[in-house]
Interface confidence: medium
C-alpha cells in the first residue's frame, strides 16, 4: 500500500483580491499521477467544480471569467489518483473588492501636520458598514481594524494615531465591509497623503510600494507586497 497522496497547493492569479468584473484563475497543483482535480467552495455542494489536469498532469485550471459576489469565498482543492484522493489543500480565500462604493478617507486636523501633533484618520462610507480597514502603503506592521460594537451599522470610523512623528507620514487608504460577509469589500478609498513636518526637517518621504493586507475577524495587519502570486488581501480565519 503506497503512502498518502501529497496535499495539493492552491493559488489564484493575478491574486486573491479581485475587483468586481475582473477575471481570475484558480490553480490547483498536485502530482503527476493526478487524474482529476476537484475544487470545493465552502458553503456550496461539493465538488464546486471538477477539471482534468493540464499536461504534464500535475495541475488544473479553474477559470472565473468575471468576478462577482457569487465567486467570493473560501476554496480548497484536492485531486483524485486511482483509486484514492488527496488531502484537501490549505484554504484559498478569494476576496472581491467593489462590492460597495468607495469610502472617503480624510485626515484630522489636516494632512499637513507638525511632529508631535495628534492626528486622526476618518473613514466615511456612503452606506452603513460595521468594519473598516486602514492601509498604509509600504507598511510592514499591523494597522488597526475597527469593528463596531454589537455589529452596529455605522457610516464612519475614526483611527486615532495619537502624537505623530515622521514615521507616520505616507499614503493611506481605507476600505469598508460588513462582518456577515468578510469576502466582500468596498472599493478602496482615494489615497490620502499624511505629511509630518519636524522642526528642522523637510516633509517626510512617501513610500512607493504597493499595499497588501491580512484581514480577518481577529487579525488585521498590513504586509508589504512580494512576488508571491497570492499577494493581496489575505484572510487568516483559523
Amino acid at each position: 500500500q503506497a503512502g498518502p497522496l501529497p496535499k495539493p497547493t492552491v493559488w489564484a492569479e493575478p491574486g486573491s483580491v479581485i475587483s468586481w468584473g475582473s477575471p481570475v484563475t484558480i490553480w490547483c497543483q498536485g502530482t503527476l499521477d493526478a487524474q482529476e482535480y476537484h475544487l470545493d467552495k465552502e458553503g456550496s455542494p461539493a465538488p464546486w467544480d471538477t477539471q482534468n489536469p493540464l499536461e504534464p498532469r500535475n495541475k488544473a485550471k479553474f477559470s472565473i471569467p468575471s468576478m462577482t459576489q457569487h465567486y467570493a469565498g473560501r476554496y480548497r482543492c484536492y485531486y483524485h489518483s486511482h483509486p484514492d484522493w488527496s488531502e484537501d489543500s490549505d484554504p484559498l480565500d478569494l476576496v472581491m473588492t467593489g462590492a460597495y462604493s468607495k469610502p472617503i478617507l480624510s485626515v484630522l486636523p489636516s494632512p499637513l501636520v507638525t511632529s508631535g501633533e495628534s492626528v486622526t484618520l476618518l473613514c466615511q462610507s456612503q452606506s452603513p458598514m460595521d468594519t473598516f480597514l486602514l492601509f498604509k502603503e509600504g507598511a510592514a506592521h499591523p494597522l488597526p481594524r475597527l469593528r463596531s460594537q454589537h455589529g452596529a451599522q455605522l457610516h464612519w470610523a475614526e483611527f486615532p494615531m495619537g502624537p505623530v512623528t515622521s514615521v507616520h507620514g505616507g499614503t493611506y487608504r481605507c476600505i469598508s465591509s460588513r462582518s456577515f460577509s468578510h469576502y466582500l469589500l468596498s472599493r478602496p478609498s482615494d489615497p490620502v497623503e499624511l505629511t509630518v513636518l519636524g522642526s528642522l526637517e523637510s516633509p517626510s518621504p512617501s513610500p512607493t510600494r504597493s499595499i497588501s493586507a491580512a484581514a480577518g475577524p481577529e487579525d488585521q495587519s498590513l504586509m508589504p507586497t512580494g512576488s508571491d502570486p497570492q499577494s493581496g488581501l489575505r484572510r487568516h480565519w483559523e
Epitope: Q35, H38, W85
Partner: nanobody, 121 residues
Framework: EVQLVESGGGLVQPGGSLRLSCAAS????????MGWYRQAPGKQRELVAA???????KIGDSVKGRFTISRDNAKNSVYLQMNSLRAEDTAVYYC???????????????WGQGTQVTVSS
C-alpha cells in the same frame, strides 16, 4: 458471490444512534474507496460518507457533525456511526466500493443490497 454485505440497520428513535457495518471481500476492500449512500422513498440517492484507502474521509453536508465513517483493514470492513438521528435520516443505506471519482459520479463499481434505517418515535 455477494461481495458487500451490510448489517446494523433497524428502527431507532429520534436522537438515537446506530452503527452500520459493511463486510467486503479482500480484493475489493484493499483496492477501493469504501462508502455509504442512502436513498429515501421518492428521493435521489445521495452520498453519505466515503473513506479512502489511506483513511481520508468525506462526509456529506447533511450529516456532517453527526455521522462518522471508518475502515478496519484487518477485518475488510467499513463502518458508519450515526448519532443524533433525525426522521429525515430514514432511508435504505447502501454500502459501495470503487474509485473515488466514481463516487463523485454517483456510480461506484460495487454495491451492497442495502439495509433499512428508520428513525421514528
Amino acid at each position: 458471490e455477494v461481495q458487500l454485505v451490510e448489517s446494523g440497520g433497524g428502527l431507532v428513535q429520534p436522537g438515537g444512534s446506530l452503527r452500520l457495518s459493511c463486510a467486503a471481500s479482500e480484493s475489493i476492500f484493499s483496492s477501493n474507496v469504501m462508502g455509504w449512500y442512502r436513498q429515501a422513498p421518492g428521493k435521489q440517492r445521495e452520498l453519505v460518507a466515503a473513506v479512502g484507502i489511506q483513511g481520508l474521509t468525506k462526509i456529506g453536508d447533511s450529516v456532517k457533525g453527526r455521522f462518522t465513517i471508518s475502515r478496519d483493514n484487518a477485518k475488510n470492513s467499513v463502518y458508519l456511526q450515526m448519532n443524533s438521528l433525525r426522521a429525515e435520516d430514514t432511508a435504505v443505506y447502501y454500502c459501495a466500493a470503487g474509485a473515488y471519482v466514481r463516487f463523485l459520479q454517483q456510480s461506484p463499481d460495487y454495491w451492497g443490497q442495502g439495509t433499512q434505517v428508520t428513525v421514528s418515535s
